[in-house]
């Protein structure tokens, strides 16, 4: 068998909401993956498990099952969303994310994803992890790959 390549492309969008009373931030983060099948037969993408960490703490998890199949020598782009919560011992982040004196409220999140594929009863797992900048101060849509290389040197308001 030839390889199945998984490439984490980056954050596609991040939608933010707050609970003022609980000083809690809710971030719905949609990520994009490219999965390439280099074989001459179809493979099933059985599941994708993902988690997001902030400051070494897991703030969100997601699992997608029975996602799709990828034909021979084909590639599919898959979006998956991880709901995250920044709260409790990290509630100081509420102050940062809602600070009106700054324009862009970029925080650094560790994105971890594991893709499980199957073919002819054989199962294979491929994992990737990547640090990404996400704006916790407003709803943001990113161009593919932009969130990894964000120039965080934003001018002051």
């Amino acid at each position: 068998p030839r390889s199945i390549d998984v490439k984490y492309i980056g954050v596609k969008s991040a939608y933010v909401s707050y609970d003022v009373q609980k000083r809690t931030i809710y971030l719905n983060i949609t990520n994009t993956l490219n999965i390439t099948n280099n074989n001459y037969y179809s493979v099933e993408v059985e599941n994708i498990t993902a988690q997001v960490q902030f400051a070494k703490t897991v703030i969100g998890k997601a699992r997608l099952n029975n996602i799709t199949h990828i034909g021979p020598l084909d590639m599919k782009q898959i979006d998956y969303t991880v709901p995250t919560v920044i709260a409790e011992e990290m509630s100081y982040m509420y102050d940062f994310c809602t600070l009106i004196s700054i324009k862009v409220h970029n925080i650094v999140l560790m994105m971890q994803v594991t893709v499980t594929t199957t073919y002819f009863g054989h199962s294979e797992q491929i994992s990737q992890e990547r640090y990404q900048y996400v704006d916790c101060g407003r709803n943001t849509t990113y161009q593919l790959g932009q969130s990894e290389y964000l120039n965080v040197l934003q001018p002051q308001q």
Epitope: E89, S91, Y92, F96, I107, V108, Y131, Y133, V152, L153
Partner: antibody, heavy 117, light 107 residues
Framework: QVQLQQSGAELVKPGASVKMSCKAS????????IEWMKQSHGKGLEWIGN????????KYNEKFKGKATLTVDKSSSTVYLDLSRLTSDDSAVYYC??????????WGQGTSVTVSS | DIQMTQSPASLSVSVGETVTITCRAS??????LGWYQQKQGESPQLLVF???NLADGVPSRFSGSGSGTQYSLKINSLQSEDFGTYYC?????????FGGGTRLEIK
């Protein structure tokens, strides 16, 4: 307004211990970690450790493990730094500061510790 | 531990000039960097947090920039009250460490 009020200067003998305090006011005490730094005379800053009042999580710089102990009195919103087995190397100004994302935004006025026989 | 190399160690400049202080981290610190000013006999004061954001009450002549391992603090049109020692500090992974400081002296 946010304030971190530290206890007064200490003159202590070698081998003794000292306990200094950092009283927080003007914000919800359990929300932000409190950091501690050491600044020897005319020198730079060293991070000793931090204490998060939300869950009592304490982290230390390896260099200060066994030397520094952080404790809290939540009823008075006060974090304490205890330094043991003092030597002349421990003579310094000790600062507490409030952690914020990407920087320490409020600092105490410092506590000067002089170790001398 | 992440090492922070700050330069220059000292500089002497005239009022009205522009100054840039740099800080290099021994590994990527993902913009988790603060800049502080300390005057003789006083506590450090936060100038810039998360690499680029000006702290409350800090004059707009101060600005922070950088990413990855390279960061800088720029002071435009230096004022006499800007003398003192400047420190960078990373807050990426414990232990937080500070740069060695830059002593800014007014000519």
């Amino acid at each position: 307004q946010v304030q971190l009020q530290q206890s007064g200067a200490e003159l202590v003998k070698p081998g003794a211990s000292v306990k200094m305090s950092c009283k927080a006011s003007g914000y919800t005490f359990t929300t932000f970690p409190i950091e501690w730094m050491k600044q020897s005379h005319g020198k730079g800053l060293e991070w000793i450790g931090n204490f998060h009042p939300y869950n009592d999580d304490t982290k230390y710089n390896e260099k200060f493990k066994g030397k520094a102990t952080l404790t809290v009195d939540k009823s008075s919103s006060t974090v304490y730094l205890d330094l043991s087995r003092l030597t002349s190397d421990d003579s310094a100004v000790y600062y507490c500061a409030r952690y914020f994302y990407g920087g320490m935004d409020y600092w105490g006025q410092g506590t000067s510790v002089t170790v001398s026989s | 531990d992440i090492q922070m190399t700050q330069s220059p160690a000292s500089l002497s400049v005239s009022v009205g000039e522009t100054v840039t202080i740099t800080c290099r981290a021994s590994e990527n610190i993902y913009s988790s960097l603060g800049w502080y000013q300390q005057k003789q006999g006083e506590s450090p004061q936060l100038l810039v947090f998360a690499a680029t954001n000006l702290a409350d009450g800090v004059p707009s002549r101060f600005s922070g920039s950088g990413s990855g391992t390279q960061y800088s603090l720029k002071i435009n049109s230096l004022q006499s009250e800007d003398f003192g020692t400047y420190y960078c500090q990373h807050l990426w992974s414990i232990p937080w460490t500070f740069g060695g400081g830059t002593r800014l002296e007014i000519k």
